[in-house]
């Protein structure tokens, strides 16, 4: 049969300008001598020679003079590969291929890699920034290998993926700089972090530059915004309230106004320099400008979805800066329940029926309660669940098992807890006459 | 090291257009407003305009903003003024300037003289 | 659009002098006055914005100081290189502006 060669399944990863050992190993059976052995390692594509061993001698490397085999340890089957100063361009596989009166062979791949550089933060502009600027941060990190991945964060370490553009290019060594450039408008203050990740070696190599805008000396602009979240029903239009109080002789050419997400720093809609400059939003969203000039921030949000909910953040900037956080709630009614009974015909007291009452399209979750005719909660042996469609809104499912009384009413009320509105309904069972001893 | 090369001297006609270059280098082109100023001799400086060459958002000086045009080509990190109905009070020098606020780099200046 | 008032226009001092020029504003700017240094067939350069923050490379000898509508730049010391025009220009709005420009002479 055929000779077993064995190699490891996983790939050998070596830093770039290290050794690395390519394992490879066979049985050798009692009476083996190296007089027998023909040993060749091959790059397993293009099956150009690396190094061979034949007719008892090594026959050197065939693959820029940096490969080596064990000698010593040839003889109990040992026929590994040591690869000198490894470089990029070695990653790939190689073939073990081992002859004495049979033959075999198997590949090993080699993964090369390079650990990236702490990453250099660059910030353009750098000097008089204020809130409502639009900055770019470069991070750069150099000689890795393979190619990183790149993330961004705040402060808060909430991933920034709007206005992100990575561009990374190889060098001669095949080794890549990365450059990501992300562009943000700037809040109050903030700290902005870069992560270049190696996937290979699972090296985080990280970088943060925290940006404080410059501030008047006449003091911060107060920005007021509603403390309890604007409930929207999803389909409707939402005002998320915002003012300001203006000095006299504003006029709308000093304004920075920003509506951001709070968390991801998303921009929504901004007002700068007497222009509104639009919705970044999906263009759902709409000043009020003629109430602008008299402190009126607020924004308007068109046709309400349920991935609106959360929170935005109001900034106004005018001398100075100011800013405050609104939340959206979102919310949709539940439907009228429809109510199924199973087993639906030949009910007889003591039958177990399971009742199922459904409710759709419907934000946040619902409670569901379940009660008896006279107005008695029941409790026991209840399932509900609850699924989210694309839209981001619930179908209710809830299951009363229940066993038969003579008779009796069965309520389920599906209650909404944004919008504190139930829907009920129920199915009133009435079991067929009782005989005496019951039937089998 | 920041730069800002301007093209070269131009002698127009009344009634012409005129368009002056501004070739950046040494930082990030799509970071920074590009500004245009100009200077009549023995004369102050008066700000013509602005581009943001992100996203090519342009503010004007209303006393120029039927005749001026300002555009970027980003592959080439650079900046143009096109200016139109060229009058003789219309001959100066016509500077490109970095920034939002601050002008911190300026380009050499292009002389545009306007002359029947 | 916002005016922009420099005095006065022209000014002779000799070295070692202090030197002071004035820049006023038709409305309140809060502090977003820069100071410009402009030397003949040369382009402008920028020595303080923010009313009083000192450009990098600029001498310690300019100081700029003032805020809402009055602003001063302050030469302590004038050396024979400061020989020059001098703008003030106002960043608070849309046109930017620039006041007429004061020109430094040797006396």
């Known amino acids: 049969g055929a000779l077993e060669v064995q190699v490891p399944e996983d790939p050998v990863v070596a830093l770039v300008g290290t050794d690395a050992t390519l394992c490879c190993s066979f049985s050798p059976e009692p009476g083996f001598s190296l007089a027998q052995l023909n040993l060749i390692w091959q790059l397993t594509d293009t099956k150009q020679l690396v190094h061979s061993f034949a007719e008892g001698q090594d026959q050197g490397s065939a693959y820029a003079n940096r490969t080596a085999l064990f000698p010593d340890l040839l003889a109990q089957g040992n026929a590994s590969l040591r690869l000198q100063r490894v470089r990029v361009a070695d990653e790939g596989s190689f073939t073990c291929f081992v002859s004495i009166r049979d033959f075999g062979s198997a590949a090993v791949s080699l993964q090369v890699a390079a650990p990236y550089s702490k990453p250099s933060m660059t910030l353009e502009p750098n000097k008089d920034l204020r809130p409502g600027d639009t900055v770019t941060i470069t991070c750069s990190s150099y000689q890795g290998y393979p190619e990183a991945e790149v993330f961004w964060q705040d402060g808060q370490g909430v991933p920034l993926t709007g206005n992100v553009t990575t561009s990374q290019m190889a060098n001669e060594q095949g080794l890549f700089d990365v450059h990501s450039i992300l562009r943000v408008v700037l809040g109050a203050n903030g700290t902005y972090s870069c992560l270049v990740r190696n996937p290979v070696l699972q090296q985080d190599a990280h970088s943060s530059v925290t940006i404080t805008p410059q501030r008047s000396p006449t003091g911060a602009v107060e920005v007021q915004v509603p403390e309890d979240p604007v409930v929207a029903l999803v389909g409707t239009d939402a005002t998320l309230r915002c003012s300001f109080s203006p000095e006299p002789g504003f006029s709308l050419a000093q304004l920075n106004l920003i509506w951001q997400l709070t968390d991801t720093k998303q921009l929504v809609h901004s007002f700068t320099e007497g222009r509104d400059q639009g919705s970044a939003y999906a263009n759902r969203t709409a000043l009020f400008p003629d109430l602008l000039a008299q402190g009126n921030a607020s924004l308007r949000l068109q046709r309400v979805r349920v991935a609106d909910e959360g929170s935005f953040t109001c900034f106004v900037s005018i001398r100075d800066f100011g800013s405050a956080a609104v939340s959206l709630q979102v919310a949709a009614p539940y439907s009228k329940p429809s109510m199924t009974l199973e087993p639906n015909k030949d009910l007889r007291p003591g039958d177990t029926v399971t009742i199922t009452c459904s409710s759709y399209r419907g934000y946040p979750e619902a409670e569901v309660f379940w009660q008896d005719g006279q107005g008695v909660p029941l409790t026991g042996n209840v399932t509900t669940s609850q699924m989210a469609n694309e839209q981001g809104l619930f179908d209710v499912h809830s299951v009363l098992r229940v066993v038969l009384g003579a008779n009796g009413t069965y309520s389920c009320l599906v209650r909404n807890p944004v919008l504190q509105q139930d829907a009920h309904g129920s199915v009133t069972i009435t079991g067929q006459p009782m005989t005496f001893p019951p039937e089998a | 090291e920041v730069q800002l090369v301007q093209s070269g001297a131009e002698v127009k006609k009344p009634g012409s257009s005129v368009k002056v270059s501004c070739k950046a280098s040494g930082y990030t082109f799509t970071a920074y407003w590009m500004n245009w100023v100009r200077q009549a001799p023995g004369q102050g400086l008066e700000w013509i305009g602005r581009?943001?060459?992100?996203?090519?958002?342009?503010r004007y000086n209303q006393n120029f903003r039927d005749r001026v045009t300002l555009t970027v080509d980003k592959s080439s990190s650079t900046a143009y003024m096109e200016l139109s109905s060229l009058r003789s009070e219309d001959t100066a020098v016509y500077y490109c300037?970095?920034?939002?606020?601050?002008?911190?780099?300026w380009g050499q200046g292009t002389t545009v003289t306007v002359s029947s | 659009d916002i005016q922009m008032t420099q005095s006065p226009s022209s000014l002779s001092a000799s070295v070692g002098d202090r030197v002071t020029i004035t820049c006023r504003t038709s409305?309140?700017?809060?502090?977003?006055l820069a100071w410009y240094q402009q030397k003949p067939g040369k382009s402008p350069k920028l020595l303080i914005y923010n009313a009083n923050t000192l450009e990098e490379g600029v001498p310690s000898r300019f100081r700029g100081s003032g805020s809402g509508t009055h602003f001063t730049l302050t030469i302590s010391s004038l050396q024979p290189e400061d020989f020059a025009t001098y703008f003030c220009?106002?960043?608070?709005?849309?046109?930017?502006?620039f006041g007429g420009g004061t020109k430094v002479e040797i006396k």
């Open positions: 581009i943001e060459p992100y996203d090519s958002e342009t």
């Open positions: 300037a970095r920034g939002v606020r601050i002008f911190d780099y």
């Open positions: 409305e309140n700017i809060d502090y977003t």
């Open positions: 220009k106002q960043a608070y709005d849309v046109p930017r502006t």
